[in-house]
């Protein structure tokens, strides 16, 4: 449209803006590392950090892993969105005995009310079935008058779920009498990351709870106990150890009771985008530091961006191939740094410019 030309030229003359012909507007160019929250950003506030698939942007502006609902006893209640985690809940017919942020660490089958009791409140994903005594002549659930008497203590007995895995679900039809349900409030808050083992839902002891035996004097075993692959953080919370299961990572330090596993890039690679106790993006070690916009040592230490050299440049620190072209691995292509986006295990993108050379090298 000819009438757009002056506006378009004015806009193009401003390095901080670009003209989007599709919407015929001048748009604010988000700085490297930030991504627009709308089609045509108008101001810096319209730009935010972008996260990899299966990660979301938390309140602090960090890319955080969405919880995984891959365990057999969990279902996805809410999907992973750009600004909120996936939310998991227990499968139908189960309730959460030990809740964790956006998920459940332990699901149990809903109890069946014993003879003489009737369902007061049906079980939900959060609560177990609540039973109450059946009044004589009110409910056909009373098999005999004895079962329908009020309890002498005046309390309402509740079925206590038997900790069983889904594989032994028949055990849940034998609930214990007179107990109370496991309180969710008493459960420790765990943060479960993708890749943590499926055994999390079926441990031998309650996660985050102290040993049931009284502490032997002088024993060091009275500290809070976390699930396997979880550690006790500074705030006393059971937190998931990071996973080093990605092909480009190796374990540097194992997951301990009070410290996370630490991952680092495998030999021959450097960290382009660091993450807590791990590396979000490993890239092949360049021929030399002069070839990238960021020094390798910087990459290993802080969240930074990887910038390829201008197209056609060749660093002086390594022999140039006979044809004068740089090796394919040294100058990223259209998506060589992001072709892993389809993988659900990879965190945080570099969001930095990558070179697109007409040679494809």
């Amino acid at each position: 449209f000819p009438q757009d030309r002056p506006f378009e030229d004015t806009c193009r003359g401003n390095p901080g803006h670009y003209y989007d012909k599709a919407v015929r507007r001048c748009c604010y160019r988000c700085p490297t590392g930030l991504f627009p929250t709308q089609q045509c950003p108008q101001r810096p506030a319209d730009c935010r950090k972008q996260c990899e698939p299966d990660y979301y942007l938390d309140e602090a502006g960090r890319c955080t892993a969405c919880v995984s609902c891959s365990r057999d006893d969990l279902v996805e209640k809410m999907p992973c969105a750009w600004n909120s985690s996936r939310v998991c809940e227990c499968q139908p017919g189960m309730f959460c005995a030990v809740s964790v942020v956006n998920s459940c660490a332990r699901c149990f089958f809903h109890s069946v009310c014993p003879a003489g009791m009737i369902v007061k409140f049906p079980g939900t994903a959060q609560k177990n079935t609540v039973c109450e005594p059946a009044s004589p002549g009110v409910s056909p659930a009373c098999a005999s008058p004895e079962n329908c008497k009020e309890p002498s203590s005046g309390t309402i007995p509740q079925a206590k779920p038997t900790p069983v895995s889904p594989a032994t679900s028949n055990a849940s039809t034998m609930p214990l009498r007179g107990g109370t349900r496991l309180a969710q409030e008493a459960a420790s808050k765990l943060t479960r990351a993708p890749g943590s083992p499926s055994s999390v839902g079926r441990p031998s002891s309650d996660p985050g709870l102290s040993p049931t035996q009284p502490c032997p004097q002088g024993s060091g075993d009275c500290r809070k106990q976390c699930e396997p692959d979880y550690y006790l953080d500074e705030a006393g919370r059971c937190t998931a150890c990071v996973s080093c299961s990605r092909d480009d990572l190796v374990e540097k330090t194992p997951c301990a009771w009070n410290s996370s596993r630490i991952c680092e890039c495998r030999p021959g690679m450097i960290c382009a985008t660091s993450a807590t106790n791990s590396c979000a993006r490993c890239v092949p070690y360049p021929i030399c530091a002069a070839e990238t916009g960021t020094k390798p040592q910087d990459m290993a230490e802080k969240d930074t961006t990887f910038e390829a050299p201008p197209v056609g440049t060749q660093p002086d620190c390594s022999p140039t191939p006979e044809n004068g072209e740089a090796p394919a691995s040294t100058s990223p292509t259209l998506s060589s740094l992001v072709d892993s986006q389809a993988s659900k295990t990879l965190p945080i993108p570099t969001s930095a410019p990558i070179a697109l050379s007409s040679t494809g090298k």
């Epitope: 670009y18 599709a22 748009c27 988000c30 991504f35 627009p36 709308q38 972008q50 259209l334 969001s351």
Partner: nanobody, 123 residues
Amino acid sequence: QVKLVESGGGSVQAGGSLRLSCAASGYIYSSNCMGWFRQAPGKEREWVARIHTGSGSTYYADSVKGRFTISQDNAKNTVYLQMNSLRPEDTAMYDCAAGRVVLGAVVCTNEYWGQGTQVTVSS
């Protein structure tokens, strides 16, 4: 400076096929997208198709779904638009655009544009 160069346009009979290419050079953002727009004389610019180059996710306008296919060749930094079963109403100037994926959406910022390639479909 990002440069987008389109090619592959031309004249074809209705029902025929064409393959447009958009070669990118220079810098472009890593979490990026490339797509095609078209504009027929006297008509509004119309979005045709888009590919998110990192994930390979593709999106199409309803008017071209099932007939057009967008793809990429990372080694050549090129995006293609394979156009089959062409119709006279597909006649337009086809522009390649590139930019960044808008956070939490399936739209592109279209920060960079090529010069366009003409496609003419005769009945």
